[in-house]
């Protein structure tokens, strides 16, 4: 918030020493020119003394057809050169010229700092004709002046392709100091020096700066704007502002909070989104960052099965997104999971721990000692196997999947059978005679299907052939057995 003090009564010149053609404002006009009622224009006066030769931009009229005599050169009359006034006051200034009546369609335009003032400006041109010349007075008024109205104003008139330009009228709006740079909120390291900058301008100048910390002035003597405050270090949060003083009063900058960087608060709301046999997807809500950006986070995973080792795994991850997929976990196991995040100061405490479980895994080993033989009398294939030594993480065995592929004369057909967990043998009907049947078996848990056993092949002869010799899983390293009858 900007605070403005009461405007001071004493005038304060913009430049040191007297300036010709310049005067403080807020007096009644000395010119008896018509002006819009309600205005109280500032005092205006000519920048040159009476009788002083004029050297401005003039138009030299051509010889008249009547008397072949030269008309005097056209020029704007001298007027006030410098107007000093306070913000929010009204001002009216003008320029005047006497134009011989031989000239028609004369228009006066107003310019500020080299740009024509068009549109919604209070510019009024009044004409006072007599026998030979017309006095033209162009008035320009500004209601409730602002700093942006500061500048050099001129009148221009075009006659016979000649441009007549008046002397400039300098408008100087004075007011309370105006901040061009205010201190900024900062997050700083404890007991570490930092700088704050404050800059304010008039007019009027000079502008002096006082610094304020937690409502108390820091500097006894003011510093001329701009001012840099070096704070040797803070141990706790503080609020700083600066006061800018000039002869019109004082303006106070916004108060800025200087925060002390600290370790972050622990993350909250650690949640489980998805669990598989060997991974858990978690998310969390970051805690307060301690006025310093998060750098990374650490996901801590602790085995909590009643009789686990209790191994602690720590996974480092980026601070964003606030999610992480924990991998390399054991199937069918319980874990306690916590998250901690760090900034430049250090690590937060660990979030509240949450419990999570992985699901059953698929078996990791295939059934053993698979044997296959043909029972020709029943026209089926008898399959036997041994239950695999499944790891407990695979969960409870729910059954077996039997794949049997029938190949004969370029035709190949795969069929799948499911049998219960208590079985260690199965019978499948012969699908094709004079063909090879290839059998593979996999154990199944709720976690999925395990690896298939090595293929065992048996030849199914045409009707009438008899064989009872089994085909079985090879010893490691042997080629797939094929029993041809």
């Amino acid at each position: 918030a900007i605070t403005e003090a009461r405007e001071e009564a004493k005038p304060y010149p913009l430049f040191p020493g007297p300036l010709p053609g310049s005067l403080q404002t807020d007096h009644t006009s000395l010119l008896s020119l018509p002006h819009t009622s309600g205005y109280q224009p500032a005092l205006m006066f000519s920048p040159t003394q009476p009788g002083r030769p004029y050297t401005g931009n003039v138009a030299i009229p051509r010889v008249t057809s009547a008397g072949s005599k030269l008309l005097p050169p056209l020029a704007f009359k001298h007027t006030v050169g410098h107007i000093i006034l306070s913000e929010h006051k009204d001002v009216k200034f003008n320029c005047s010229i006497s134009v011989p009546n031989i000239y028609q369609d004369t228009t006066i335009s107003w310019w500020k700092d080299g740009k024509e003032l068009l549109g919604a400006h209070h510019a009024i041109t009044q004409f006072y004709p007599d026998d030979e010349v017309t006095a033209i007075i162009a008035s320009f008024s500004i209601t409730s002046v602002q700093r942006s109205d500061n500048g050099s104003y001129i009148c221009k008139m075009k006659i016979n392709n000649e441009e007549i330009v008046s002397d400039p009228i300098y408008i100087e709006v004075q007011g309370l100091p105006h901040f061009t740079k205010q201190p900024e909120s900062m997050n700083v390291t404890r007991n570490t020096a930092f700088n704050l900058t404050c800059q304010a301008v008039g007019p009027p100048e000079p502008v002096n700066i006082f610094w304020v910390q937690n409502s108390s002035r820091v500097n006894e003597q003011p510093e001329k704007s701009p001012s840099v405050l070096t704070v040797p270090g803070l141990t706790e949060m503080a609020v700083f502002s600066c006061e800018a003083h000039n002869d019109k009063g004082l303006t106070v900058s916004k108060g800025v909070q200087i925060n002390i960087k600290a370790i972050p608060s622990p993350p909250t709301e650690v949640s489980i989104h998805n669990s598989t046999a060997h991974s858990i997807l978690i998310s969390w809500v970051p805690g307060f960052d301690g006025y310093s950006p998060f750098r990374n986070c650490s996901v801590q995973v602790k085995e909590v099965d009643p009789l686990s080792n209790g191994s602690v795994m720590i996974f480092n991850t980026s601070a964003s997104p606030h999610m992480y997929q924990i991998k390399q976990l054991q199937a069918l196991a319980n874990y306690s999971i916590g998250v901690s995040c760090m900034n430049e100061i250090g690590w937060s405490a660990v979030s509240p721990w949450i419990l999570a479980s992985t699901t059953e895994g698929a078996p990791s080993v295939a059934p053993l000692n698979v044997t296959v033989f043909l029972n020709e009398s029943r026209d089926n294939v008898d399959i036997r196997w041994m239950k695999p030594l499944t790891k407990r993480q695979a969960g409870e065995l729910v059954g077996y999947r039997i794949s049997h592929v029938w190949q004969s004369a370029g035709i190949s057909k795969e069929l799948l059978e499911e049998v219960g967990q208590n079985n260690s043998r199965a019978q499948i009907s012969v699908q094709v005679h004079n063909a090879t049947c290839t059998v593979r078996i996999a154990a199944v848990t709720k976690g999925g299907v395990g690896p298939f056993s090595d293929p065992v092949k048996i030849f199914i002869p045409a009707h009438g052939w008899v064989d009872h010799a089994p085909s079985s899983t090879p010893a490691p390293g042997n080629a797939d057995p094929v029993l041809i009858i």
Partner: antibody
Framework: QVQLQQPGAELVKPGASVKVSCKAS????????MHWMKQRPGQGLEWIGR????????NYNEKFTDKATLTVDKSSSTAYMQLSSLTSEDSAVYYC???????WGQGTTLTASS | DILLTQSPATLSVTPGETVSLSCRAS??????LHWFQQRSHRSPRLLIK???DSISGIPSRFTGSGSGTDYTLSINSVKPEDEAIYYC?????????FGAGTKLELK
């Protein structure tokens, strides 16, 4: 190699408290649960509870919640079990063991007697 | 709490014999069963974990099997140093509970 060192014996008066120690070495102390078991003379084993030195997380057998307090000192890699309001029923051998109970201390024989 | 029932309470065998010790749980413990040997005046020693997983340094004559609620510890060709009390322990839920033990005596 992994070692769990316990004092051989503690003699305490009934009504008093005792703090049994278990000093660990040969492994990362903060990476394994520390369990405590009780075995009365000629009896079977009872599980008292466990503590995780990483964050002092504890689980107790409800039967021992008012009797035993488990703590750790990470700096010395030592686990402690404090037993309070001792009676003759507390006279037993107390074991510490880690992880899957593959490593056990030698046991501390506690005698509560006046 | 999960109750573990061990049988027999005592087993008397001749060296060289093969023996089977039984442990039955009051509910399914999903193979989270462990076997310990405790010789006289010694700390217990882990023999088998998770029903059938062998432990490094334990003689191969000790094997475990079972699932659900029924578990067995087999000792192939018993040796004199196997005389001890054998405990089963469930690690499925807290509190961890031990069986009452089976005492193996050698004739």
């Amino acid at each position: 190699q992994v070692q769990l060192q316990q004092p051989g014996a503690e003699l305490v008066k009934p009504g008093a408290s005792v703090k049994v120690s278990c000093k660990a070495s040969g492994y990362t102390f903060t990476n394994y649960w520390m369990h405590w078991m009780k075995q009365r003379p000629g009896q079977g084993l009872e599980w008292i509870g466990r503590i995780h030195p990483f964050d002092s997380d504890t689980n107790y057998n409800e039967k021992f919640t008012d009797k035993a307090t488990l703590t750790v000192d990470k700096s010395s890699s030592t686990a402690y079990m404090q037993l309070s309001s001792l009676t003759s029923e507390d006279s037993a051998v107390y074991y510490c063991a880690i992880g899957t109970l593959i490593y056990w201390g030698q046991g501390t024989t506690l005698t509560a007697s006046s | 709490d999960i109750l573990l029932t061990q049988s027999p309470a005592t087993l008397s065998v001749t060296p060289g014999e093969t023996v089977s010790l039984s442990c039955r749980a009051s509910q399914s413990i999903y193979k989270k069963l462990h076997w310990f040997q405790q010789r006289s005046h010694r700390s217990p020693r882990l023999l088998i974990k998770f029903a059938s997983d062998s432990i490094s340094g334990i003689p191969s004559r000790f094997t475990g099997s079972g699932s659900g609620t029924d578990y067995t510890l087999s000792i192939n060709s018993v040796k004199p140093e196997d005389e001890a009390i054998y405990y089963c322990l469930q690690g499925y839920s807290t509190p961890l509970t031990f069986g009452a033990g089976t005492k193996l005596e050698l004739k």
